[in-house]
Structures are given as structure tokens and as C-alpha cells.
């Protein structure tokens, strides 16, 4: 198959909604950047549809995306990261819809990892620490983190704390005693770059101590 639509297909195609969204990840694999796009309507027939990016590239005018099931993906060193690129949905040589986007404004950081919680008995608090690959990066270094925690039995009652460092102290008196808590963290660009929240880190689970009756404090 050539990938070109028949005339009838093209006419049908023009009736469809080809709106799409994209996010970039800078230095996601060494010095390689990635760009991921997907249609907003999951029911779009993507059989003959391709994505292409042109402009603000190094040593090439345009690049084609690879199709990975429902998403379209590029990993390359060739993003100039200056100025807007034109991202188009195409059938053959015909562009169905295009967006001009600066890839530094649609950055989705990598998810934080190594989340852990340590109880400090003497201080009566919990020290939350996590790691992010962005500390080692040249570009998207400065992030805002969103730490969310909840008592495991409270399905949707998350408490959120925003912070710019990778360490947070939770006071013991603010938590329920003898309870199981779930905690997770995500990140968003906070300086120069714009974009979206990362995926959540894997959750970490910890239990708060019992109340010590003599002192009114937790064990």
C-alpha cells in the first residue's frame, strides 16, 4: 500500500476532527530529545495518517514521526529548541491540520523516582526524599514538584504540597496515628521552559506510629 488516500477517503478525512496534542522531553536519552503526539479523539482512524515536523531543526528541514500503536514519536538530536516548528498531520503529501509549536513550551519532565519516607523519632517528623533525572540535565533543570499524600482509606482525599527541592518534612502531628499512608510525586517545568506535569512517581507506602499514651505522642 502506498499510504496515499483515494479521493473518497480524503473527502471523508476532511470531515474528521484531527486535533492533536504533543509533548517534548529534552535530553531524555543522553543528548537526544523526544517528541510525542497523539490524537485527542481516540476513535480517529489512523491507518493512513502520518505526522511530520518541519522547521527549527538542525541540518534537516523536516522529520517524520514513527507510529507506535496510538501515538506518534520522534527521538532525535536535531531539535534546534529555538523558534516554532510546524507539526502536521498528513495523508500522503496532503496536510490535514497543522500547529506551530515551540518545543520548549510543551515540555513534560520525566517522572521522579526513588521516593522514600523516613521517620525521625527524636524530631517527631517524617522526611520525604525523592530523586529526579533533571538535576543532571543541561536544559530543564528547574522544576516544581507536587507531593501528594493520603491516608490509604481516604480514596480521593489527597493533600498536595508544592516544593522546588527534592526533600520535604511532614510533621507527625499533622498525620493520623497508626495509619497507612500513600505518597507520590510529580514534576513540572518551573523556569524558562513551559509544559505539563510529569507522570506520577511510583507510590510509596508508610505507616505512622501509634500514640504513646503517657506523652500523648506517637510511638
Amino acid at each position: 500500500e502506498s499510504g496515499y488516500a483515494q479521493n473518497g477517503d480524503l473527502e471523508d478525512a476532511e470531515l474528521d476532527d484531527y486535533s492533536f496534542s504533543c509533548y517534548s522531553q529534552l535530553e531524555v536519552n543522553g543528548s537526544q530529545h523526544s517528541l510525542t503526539c497523539a490524537f485527542e479523539d481516540p476513535d480517529v482512524n489512523i491507518t493512513n495518517l502520518e505526522f511530520e515536523i518541519c522547521g527549527a531543526l538542525v541540518e534537516v528541514k523536516c522529520l517524520n514521526f514513527r507510529k507506535l500503536q496510538e501515538i506518534y514519536f520522534i527521538e532525535t538530536k536535531k531539535f534546534l529548541l529555538i523558534g516554532k516548528s510546524n507539526i502536521c498531520v498528513k495523508v500522503g503529501e496532503k496536510s490535514l491540520t497543522c500547529k506551530k509549536i515551540d518545543l520548549t513550551t510543551i515540555v513534560k519532565p520525566e517522572a521522579p523516582f526513588d521516593l522514600s519516607v523516613v521517620y525521625r523519632e527524636g524530631a517527631n517528623d517524617f522526611v520525604v526524599t525523592f530523586n529526579t533525572s533533571h538535576l543532571q540535565k543541561k536544559y530543564v533543570k528547574v522544576l516544581m514538584h507536587d507531593v501528594a499524600y493520603r491516608q490509604e482509606k481516604d480514596e480521593n482525599k489527597w493533600t498536595h504540597v508544592n516544593l522546588s527541592s527534592t526533600k520535604l518534612t511532614l510533621l507527625q502531628r499533622k498525620l493520623q496515628p497508626a495509619a497507612m499512608y500513600e505518597i507520590k510525586v510529580r514534576s513540572i517545568p518551573d523556569h524558562y521552559f513551559k509544559g505539563f506535569w510529569s507522570e506520577w512517581s511510583p507510590s510509596y507506602y508508610f505507616r505512622t506510629p501509634e500514640i504513646n499514651n503517657s506523652s500523648g505522642e506517637m510511638d
Partner: antibody
Framework: EVQLVESGGGLVKPGGSLRLSCAAS????????MHWVRQAPGKGLEWVSL????????YYADSVKGRFTISRDNAKNSLYLQMNSLRAEDTAVYYC??????????WGQGTLVTVSS | NFMLTQPHSVSESPGKTVTISCTRS????????VQWYQQRPGSSPTTVIY?????PSGVPDRFSGSIDSSSNSASLTISGLKTEDEADYYC?????????FGGGTKLTVL
């Protein structure tokens, strides 16, 4: 209507400094890549520097690297070029240009910098 | 680093067609877009062609741009020449983040 108005040019002695400004209006300044381009009297265009929409990315021609600094203030819709250690060969009309969706759609009227003792 | 070489001057009569070439010294002309600027005497440059062959709104369709891989060059063609087309014309491309300009071509409409 898009407008770019340069100012700050003038006569300066070799080794001296000048700060050029470019006031922008009529477009979304804070998502536009901005450039400085210069033109020596009777000569062609020479690219000087560029700055990304956010000020993070800055690049310079080899001829000015280490002497000139490009910056922007998005709150004031303004572009700047701090020029230090000026030389006679820096004498030129300096244009600010908006890249927008493509380079040079809009240029200012230019400001003349003369470096002479 | 590459250079863009243009003829120093060209001249032609009103109503005729003129082509200005812009040859890239190394690397492929296909590897980055070419823009063309017009600069009338005493004025700022204005874009007449961007991204090889695209015309900004307001630029007459007498102006066209093209790329020729075999000669590693870009061309600006102006048909139906008018006296107001008399100006300097510059090509421009990209070397990574740096902008590279051709030396300019003076077009005289006889």
C-alpha cells in the same frame, strides 16, 4: 500593526560601551525569538545575536562573542543588546528583528552605532 | 561554517524576468530553509520569501523562490520587473543557531 523601534545608538570611543534597546508592539512578544542584525555602512547584513522567547537560549556571532550580551524583558516588551569593548569594525546600523513563525518577517528601522576616536 | 555566495549585481529591463542565485559553499542547500530579503535604499530589510518558496502576505506573486539541489543553490525569481523592485536582495539560511546571510545582490531595473 507590528512595530519594532530601536534606540540607544550614537558615537562612542573604541573600548567604550553602549546599550541598545528595541521596543516591540503589535504582536505577542513573549513567544517570539528575537535577533539583532547589523549592517556596516555600504556593506551587507551580518547576524549578531539571538535570544529565545524566555531568555534561556542566547547565541552570538563569533565576531561579538564575549563582548556583547543580548537580553529581553518580556514584561516591558523590550529587547536589549549590551555592547562592551567596542571596536571600529562594530560601526553599523543595528536592526532588531522578530523571528515569529519565520525569521525577519518584521525588522525595526535600525539605530546607528559609530565607534571612532 | 558555510558561506552563501550571491552575484554582486544584476540588471534587467522593466517587464522582464530576473533570477538571483545563492550558492551554499559546503553542506547541502536542502538541509535548512532559505529566506530572501529586499532592502530598498535607506530602508530596513523586508522578507519577500521564507522557507525556500513561501511568500508573506502582501508580497506580489511576481516573487518566487526555489531550491536546486544539483547546483546546491537557492534562487529568487522576479517576473514582470518594475522600477520599484530596484533594491539589494539578500539570501539567508541557518548554521545551527547562527544565521548566515549572503553578501547581497544589487538589482538595477534599467
Amino acid at each position: 500593526e507590528v512595530q519594532l523601534v530601536e534606540s540607544g545608538g550614537g558615537l562612542v570611543k573604541p573600548g567604550g560601551s553602549l546599550r541598545l534597546s528595541c521596543a516591540a508592539s503589535g504582536f505577542t512578544f513573549d513567544d517570539s525569538v528575537m535577533h539583532w542584525v547589523r549592517q556596516a555602512p555600504g556593506k551587507g547584513l551580518e547576524w549578531v545575536s539571538l535570544v529565545g522567547w524566555d531568555g534561556f537560549f542566547t547565541y552570538y556571532a563569533d565576531s561579538v562573542k564575549g563582548r556583547f550580551t543580548i537580553s529581553r524583558d518580556n514584561a516591558k516588551n523590550s529587547l536589549y543588546l549590551q555592547m562592551n569593548s567596542l571596536r571600529a569594525e562594530d560601526t553599523a546600523v543595528y536592526y532588531c528583528a522578530r523571528q515569529g513563525d519565520y525569521m525577519g518577517n518584521n525588522w525595526g528601522q535600525g539605530t546607528l552605532v559609530t565607534v571612532s576616536s | 561554517n558555510f558561506m552563501l555566495t550571491q552575484p554582486h549585481s544584476v540588471s534587467e529591463s522593466p517587464g522582464k524576468t530576473v533570477t538571483i542565485s545563492c550558492t551554499r559553499s559546503s553542506g547541502s542547500i536542502d538541509s535548512s530553509y532559505v529566506q530572501w530579503y529586499q532592502q530598498r535604499p535607506g530602508s530596513s530589510p523586508t522578507t519577500v520569501i521564507y522557507e525556500d518558496d513561501q511568500r508573506p502576505s502582501g508580497v506580489p506573486d511576481r516573487f518566487s523562490g526555489s531550491i536546486d539541489s544539483s547546483s546546491n543553490s537557492a534562487s529568487l525569481t522576479i517576473s514582470g520587473l518594475k522600477t520599484e523592485d530596484e533594491a539589494d536582495y539578500y539570501c539567508q539560511s541557518y548554521d545551527f543557531h547562527h544565521l548566515v546571510f549572503g553578501g547581497g545582490t544589487k538589482l538595477t531595473v534599467l
